[in-house]
């Protein structure tokens, strides 16, 4: 079954996917597609990388993470209800049938007016299976869970901390990371 992630209409959604390159600069092509992973490739490709670069992308889809180190998590800007559905992250490891495929379910909720958020850091036990992203318009500040007003630099730091934590291990165990080499 797919791991589920949530975002609100008008905000940015984050779908995590990681791998560990065998060596610096020795990258593996990755594709992201809308719809479950087919036998080969990605259906309805929204973004693709090659050995070095993002070489195909469509509007609103991008990799915010350090993808040359294996963070190929997808950011979808300014989501709408139509963005709901299953997304495929495919790590295209050389060789026959070697690809690693991850299906991630994105649930988009209607935007709701909320009171000024508090600044608590409330990581629920469900974090690995529900990662909510919020922002203040496309390509601007994103926050994870209930962490308001954190800038992207802080998020990057937070993400690194999470990746080293048990929560991150749980997240990876749930099917969004692969070590190569």
């Amino acid at each position: 079954s797919e791991v589920e992630y949530r975002a609100e209409v008008g905000q940015n959604a984050y779908l995590p996917c990681f791998y560990t390159p065998a060596a610096p600069g020795n990258l593996v092509p990755v594709c992201w597609g809308k719809g479950a992973c087919p036998v080969f490739e990605c259906g309805n490709v929204v973004l693709r990388t090659d050995e070095r670069d993002v070489n195909y992308w469509t509007s609103r889809y991008w990799l915010n993470g350090d993808f040359r180190k294996g963070d190929v998590s997808l950011t979808i800007e300014n989501v709408t209800l139509a963005d709901s559905g299953i997304y495929c992250c495919r790590i295209q490891i050389p060789g026959i049938m070697n690809d690693e495929k991850f299906n991630l379910k994105l649930v988009i909720k209607p935007a709701k007016v909320t009171p000024a958020p508090t600044r608590q850091r409330d990581f629920t036990a469900a974090f690995p299976r529900m990662l909510t992203t919020r922002g203040h318009g496309p390509a601007e500040t994103q926050t994870l869970g209930s962490l308001p007003d954190i800038n992207l630099t802080q998020i990057s730091t937070l993400a690194n901390e999470l990746r080293d934590s048990r929560l991150a291990n749980d997240l990876r165990d749930s099917g969004a990371t692969i070590r190569i080499g």
Partner: antibody, heavy 126, light 108 residues
């Protein structure tokens, strides 16, 4: 000392080809990417393409696709950029630049163009 | 391709002043792989900042980079005489790699 030394200035006629060389020293040539960037007189910088000096893979900007060929000679630690069907608009300084790929434990996975050649002036004139 | 727009085109300042240069991308820069270069007449560009905010080797700490997504800034905290030059931003995550049009920092 890490450095890139390019070949000398060239004057070519429209329709001709030019091949510029870039000799690397002071580092392991095959561990890096080499890019080519050009700059027309008084203008900005324009990326042309890269070569993975290790495996020879290349990528070119769509603008130059079909006219540019980037190669390398690992035994000579040298990269080459050949541009064909020259026209007057190709008059520019052509630079090679190394793309430093950092080890995984560094903060960022890529270091941009950290070392540049001195540039090669190519003049296209009839 | 990602278009990078730099502003202002020219910045006229005196030594000791603070310089703030802007680079705006038409789309988000993947990996935040954005670099800043300095170029002086007759010379090759010199890498100042990579990954939007990391200083390259040997670059004085008066140079700092910030930003993410589509908006990036290069700040020179106190201009030295040798800092008057043209500055370019570049995104190097999505092909084709692209450069901004440059900002000239000149002596007032």
């Amino acid at each position: 000392e890490v450095q890139l030394v390019q070949s000398g200035a060239e004057v070519k006629k429209p329709g001709a080809s030019v091949k510029v060389s870039c000799k690397a020293s002071g580092y392991t040539f095959t561990s890096y990417y080499m890019h080519w960037v050009r700059q027309a007189p008084g203008q900005g910088l324009e990326w042309m393409g890269w070569i993975n000096a290790g495996n020879g893979n290349t990528k070119y900007s769509q603008k130059f696709q079909g006219r540019v060929t980037i190669t390398r000679d690992t035994s000579a630690s040298t990269a080459y950029m050949e541009l064909s069907s020259l026209r007057s608009e190709d008059t520019a300084v052509y630079y090679c630049a190394r793309d430093h790929v950092l080890p995984l434990y560094y903060g960022s996975g890529s270091y941009a163009f950290d070392i540049w050649g001195q540039g090669t002036m190519v003049t296209v004139s009839s | 391709e990602i278009v990078l727009t730099q502003s202002p085109g020219t910045l006229s300042l005196s030594p000791g002043e603070r310089a703030t240069l802007s680079c705006r991308a038409s789309q988000s820069v993947s990996g935040n792989y954005l670099a800043w270069y300095q170029q002086k007449p007759g010379q090759a560009p010199r890498l100042l900042i990579y990954g939007a905010s990391s200083r390259a080797t040997g670059i004085p700490d008066r140079f700092s980079g910030s930003g993410s997504g589509t908006d990036f800034t290069l700040t020179i905290s106190r201009l030295e005489p040798e800092d008057f030059a043209v500055y370019y931003c570049q995104q190097y995550g999505s092909s084709p790699y692209t450069f901004g049009g440059g900002t000239k920092v000149e002596i007032k």
